[in-house]
Amino acid sequence: APVRSLNCTLRDSQQKSLVMSGPYELKALHLQGQDMEQQVVFSMSFVQGEESNDKIPVALGLKEKNLYLSCVLKDDKPTLQLESVDPKNYPKKKMEKRFVFNKIEINNKLEFESAQFPNWYISTSQAENMPVFLGGTKGGQDITDFTMQFVSS
């Protein structure tokens, strides 16, 4: 059976939207009005992995682009990157470990924990216009909570 996917946008808990910053980076900033069209639309795929009521394994692709968020070690540090893939082969049910995030729902907010690096989360900075990154702390200065907005196909 083909992998189930949905289209969505994400905003952090400060209502910052995610936009492309160069070919392989996302940044978070406040958008209004027509500028909202700049925000990236994700194709969130529901993939194979350990699942529970509040934790669902997903992959986050950029809609109609052959790019996925992935987590790898760079200079011995877990790092978030946008990785290009062969569109003939993705998305798929059995994604490589680096592409998998545990979507965790807590109090109507979402966290995205790296399956490859437990306790590391997709994060944004308090500051405007800064890169989206993989952070190893929750509840500190950096933001790890998001809301999801469904986008019609």
Epitope: G49, D86, K97, A115, Q116
Partner: antibody
Framework: EVQLVESGGGLVQPGGSLRLSCAAS??????????VGWVRQAPGKGLEWVSH???????SYNPSLKSRFTISRDNSKNTLYLQMNSLRAEDTAVYYC????????????WGQGTLVTVSS | EIVMTQSPSTLSASVGDRVIITCRAS??????LSWYQQKPGKAPKLLIY???KLHSGVPSRFSGSGSGAEFTLTISSLQPDDFATYYC?????????FGQGTKLTVK
Amino acid sequence: EVQLVESGGGLVQPGGSLRLSCAASGFSLSTSGMGVGWVRQAPGKGLEWVSHIWWDGDESYNPSLKSRFTISRDNSKNTLYLQMNSLRAEDTAVYYCAKNRYDPPWFVDWGQGTLVTVSS
Amino acid sequence: EIVMTQSPSTLSASVGDRVIITCRASQDISNYLSWYQQKPGKAPKLLIYYTSKLHSGVPSRFSGSGSGAEFTLTISSLQPDDFATYYCLQGKMLPWTFGQGTKLTVK
């Protein structure tokens, strides 16, 4: 010092089954980010990736083998297994246990290998 | 699956020679490539990972380069201990696949 010691190889008839073991020491199979798997090498041939399991139990298989081979592990014994069913002559190979950390993989440590011969 | 093709399949060289082995992928594999050395009756040994990073304890005469779909392993000055078979491995996409190997022999 990391050590991987395979056992369980031997002569088996076509259609038969065999379970290989890989006893690991010097590290824990359940350490976050840890991966271990099996790579085989038919006599006089190249290397072929067989199967892999991550610290959290996430398994991957070579699609050509998945229906017949099952990877598992026992964390209490720090041991990796490969259950091989419906064996064929072309499964004759040295089977190596190999360790990596994180994806994408590179195999840092290898066992000495155990020979599986499928013949009547 | 991604097919990895090594060239040449066999290579004859002398001590002191500079040797280059090529590995081509059937599609872009980023820099997710590692190289292994294997001697007869022994397990493979990791030489290089992430295309160009030298594994600890590996002599500096070994180096790796490339990106996308074409990669090279270079031995700058061949030593007697280097006669062996060399394999590349792609880790971009499951199933992980090896090249068919390059056997390095004494000329």
